[in-house]
């Protein structure tokens, strides 16, 4: 499977849209900053077989999609930008799904390292809990937007490393 240039373009567009979604200055939200403990080691990509990396990347996309497609999220962001963001995420998830079918050798490889997947899920659970505790305030959403941008850039780097392996 070739995580093509198109996929790379999608990644850049996703990050660009996240940047455009910003509604308030991060500096006005410094008191709301929070360490969500992003599981960075799961995106190092060295310990991964390709199938497992694909799986972790998809988890990241799906959880991001889930987070930003809630009612509370729809109220917090510009609808047009949000829809464009969904489209990019959806396209990337489709590409990754197709990769599992196309990838030679994936059949023999376990599709997941359960610890990695659970680490990503727990990371998003921490984000969801934070938003609930902060009652979905504009500053809380801004902190989360910045956090997701950071984590998506780790995903992008992992994808670049996978492409170099191709």
């Amino acid at each position: 499977c070739n995580l093509s240039q198109t996929h790379s373009l999608n990644n850049r567009r996703t990050l660009m849209l996240m940047a455009q979604m910003r509604r308030i200055s991060p500096f006005s939200c410094l008191k709301d900053r929070h360490d969500f403990e992003f599981p960075q080691e799961e995106f190092d990509g060295n310990q991964f077989q390709k199938a497992q990396a694909i799986s972790v990347l998809h988890e990241m996309m799906q959880q991001t999609f889930n987070l930003f497609s809630t009612k509370n999220s729809s109220a917090a962001w510009d609808e047009t930008l949000l829809e464009k963001f969904y489209i990019e995420l959806f396209q990337q998830m489709n590409d990754l799904e197709a990769c599992v079918i196309q990838e030679v050798g994936v059949e023999e490889t376990p599709l997941m390292n359960e610890d990695s997947i659970l680490a990503v899920k727990k990371y998003f659970q921490r984000i969801t809990l934070y938003l609930m505790e902060k009652k979905y305030s504009p500053c809380a959403w801004e902190v989360v937007r910045a956090e997701i941008m950071r984590s998506l850039s780790f995903s992008t780097n992992l994808q670049k490393r996978l492409r170099r392996k191709d």
């Epitope: 694909i54 998809h58 799906q62 999609f65 969904y86 489209i87 959806f90």
Partner: antibody, heavy 126, light 110 residues
Framework: EVQLLESGAEVKRPGSSVRVSCRAS????????ISWVRQAPGQGLEWMGR????????NYAQNFRGRITITADKSPLTAYLELSSLRFEDTAVYYC???????????????????WGQGSLVTVSS | EIVLTQSPGTLSLSPGEGATLSCRAS???????LTWYQQKPGQSPRLLIY???SRATGVPDRFSGGGSGTDFTLTISRLEPEDFAVFYC???????????FGQGTKVEIK
């Protein structure tokens, strides 16, 4: 846990259309597709199509293209199946089905149906 | 388009016996995208096995899935009275997304 509740049984004339609804409740996400699957009396299961409610993106099985329309509302999360130009052989139980957000890894989630509605019987009869 | 053929059509067995159900694909299917369901009369289907071999929540360990390429199996090690039903295999292919079901295998009490 997701609950899917479908609309009641319908009797339709050949050539007419039917609209079946499926309301989702519980741990629902508009970021997961909802599919329609039908089962003719004494027969097997047949996938008809799906919709991603967050985007309204649809995919239809080849057999139904031109006769099928799937739509959705995001709040409350509800999917609709409309089938036109009904024939006798469209008599079936129509199920809505969705993945589970708890399936790990999520890449497998959209490839299967973890939750099913109770089914809605559509009878085509003259 | 992928065609899934299940065999046998009907399997007549007694409680306590083992059962092996076959699902053959007309072309290669990713085992990760192969799913099994159980359906009892008058009920909706129930997810049993996904990803080729992972049991869904609440599914007893007497059910197991295996196989790769074009040949897949569902094995029930010891049939319990509540296991008698119709079993369907289902594959997924993308893009575009297509879900295909086998015609089903009925496991009935002998």
């Amino acid at each position: 846990e997701v609950q899917l509740l479908e609309s009641g049984a319908e009797v339709k004339r050949p050539g007419s259309s039917v609209r079946v609804s499926c309301r989702a409740s519980g741990d629902t996400f508009s970021s997961y597709p909802i599919s329609w699957v039908r089962q003719a009396p004494g027969q097997g299961l047949e996938w008809m199509g799906r919709i991603l409610p967050a985007l309204g993106v649809t995919n239809y099985a080849q057999n139904f293209r031109g006769r099928i329309t799937i739509t959705a509302d995001k709040s409350p999360l509800t999917a609709y199946l409309e089938l036109s130009s009904l024939r006798f052989e469209d008599t079936a139980v129509y199920y809505c089905a969705s993945p589970s957000a708890d399936i790990i890894p999520s890449i497998l989630g959209t490839t299967l149906f973890a939750f099913w509605g109770q089914g809605s019987l559509v009878t085509v009869s003259s | 388009e992928i065609v899934l053929t299940q065999s046998p059509g009907t399997l007549s067995l007694s409680p306590g016996e083992g059962a092996t159900l076959s699902c053959r694909a007309s072309q290669n299917v990713s085992r990760h995208y192969l799913t099994w369901y159980q359906q009892k009369p008058g009920q909706s289907p129930r997810l049993l096995i996904y990803g080729g071999s992972s049991r869904a929540t609440g599914v007893p360990d007497r059910f197991s899935g295996g196989g790769s390429g074009t040949d897949f199996t569902l094995t029930i090690s010891r049939l319990e009275p509540e296991d008698f039903a119709v079993f369907y295999c289902q594959s997924y292919h993308s893009p575009p997304p297509v879900y295909t079901f086998g015609q089903g295998t009925k496991v009935e009490i002998k």
